[in-house]
Interface confidence: low
């Protein structure tokens, strides 16, 4: 029997385009999460080590990467916008962290002990100095 | 919501660390859009959010479109939405 | 809030069987994992199996062969079917449930399963 395997995360960041900042003067960040089963995510931004909720938009659900399957993997995106100013700040530190509550076959993937199977996925920019 | 100055446009963004995925960002555009999702399997596109920037009192609405393909362009990605042509702003080379 | 609720533990002799139940109430709906884990004296908790919404099944080592995880979605209950019993599977058993929703991760009180002759 072909037994379902589960799927962690990967999670990516993207930095702001330099044509929105000098458009917009914001400056959007974007996270994905991508290739992940079953969809159990929870997706959180931090910046300067504390996690932040304004400027924040989150897809509601996790999308299915290849909707026809039943058992599609998932991707999850969520922005993050931010002053121009705030993002050319290099001491400003941003991270996504996506919290995937999975079940993997030994428990390796755990930093959390108090939680076996919980799995925390992080991936992360720094302000940019202009230059 | 309402959003006060509508301003569609289409930024290409790029990751932090080497990866294959291109990631397109459509922003700033106007409630009554609708974003389509793509026809093309290897492409995704995000239903639209709604982002409220509080310390500034801003909200805007955006569409997150990302591929893994080499051909993947910003320009092609949200073509069963309709937007308009001036929204597309291409990525200058970074000179960092 | 979901709320689990483990039966069947007791003692049995080496060889023997026992079904453990694990009844979900409140937000049963948005679950969609459930496992069963054990706890030996001594030890750290392990997975023994696990179950989808899919009833796709996936076991520990230790299990396969032996032990069986199922659903019952109309009583939402869900079921570990252990057979040929070993000493070295005398733990206290919990069962446990993951759900889309906050915050995400249910455990039970755990049952008792002691293997001795």
């Known amino acids: 029997e072909d037994l379902k395997k589960v799927f962690p995360p990967k999670v990516a960041v993207f930095e702001p385009s330099e044509a929105e900042i000098s458009h917009t003067q914001k400056a959007t960040l974007v996270c994905l999460a991508t290739g992940f089963y079953p969809d159990h995510v929870e997706l959180s931004w931090w910046v300067n080590g504390k996690e932040v909720h304004s400027g924040v938009s989150t897809d509601p659900q996790p999308l299915k990467e290849q909707p026809a399957l039943e058992d599609s993997r998932y991707s999850l995106s969520s922005r993050l916008r931010v002053s121009a100013t705030f993002w050319h700040n290099p001491r400003n530190h941003f991270r996504c962290q996506v919290q995937f509550y999975g079940l993997s076959e030994d428990d390796e993937w755990t930093e959390d002990r108090d939680k076996p199977i919980t799995q925390k996925i992080s991936a992360e920019a720094w302000g940019r100095a202009d230059c | 919501p309402y959003i006060q100055n509508p301003d569609p446009a289409v930024y290409q963004l790029r990751g932090s660390k080497s990866n294959d995925t291109s990631v397109c960002l459509f922003t700033d555009f106007d409630s009554v859009m609708n974003v389509s999702q793509s026809k093309d399997s290897d492409v995704h596109i995000t239903d639209k959010t709604v982002l409220d920037m509080r310390s500034m009192d801003f909200k805007s609405n955006g569409a997150v479109a990302w591929s893994n393909k080499s051909d993947f362009a910003c320009t092609s990605a949200f073509k069963d939405s309709v937007i308009p042509a001036d929204t597309f702003f291409p990525s200058p080379e970074s000179s960092c | 809030e979901v709320q689990l609720v483990e039966s069947g533990g007791g003692v049995v002799q080496p060889g023997g069987s026992l079904r453990l139940s694990c009844v979900a109430s409140w937000d049963v709906h948005q679950i969609n994992f459930y496992g069963w884990y054990r706890q030996a004296p001594g030890k750290e908790r392990e997975k023994v199996a696990h179950?989808?919404?899919?009833?796709?099944?996936d076991y520990a080592d230790s299990a396969k062969g032996r032990f069986t995880i199922s659903r019952d979605e109309s009583k939402n209950t869900v079921y570990l079917q252990m057979n040929s019993l070993r000493p070295e599977d005398t733990a206290l058993y919990y069962c446990?449930?993951?759900?889309?929703?906050?915050?995400?991760?249910?455990w039970g009180q755990g049952t008792l399963v002691t293997v001795s002759s």
């Open positions: 446990r449930a993951l759900s889309r929703i906050w915050p995400y991760d249910y």
């Open positions: 179950i989808s919404i899919g009833d796709q099944t």
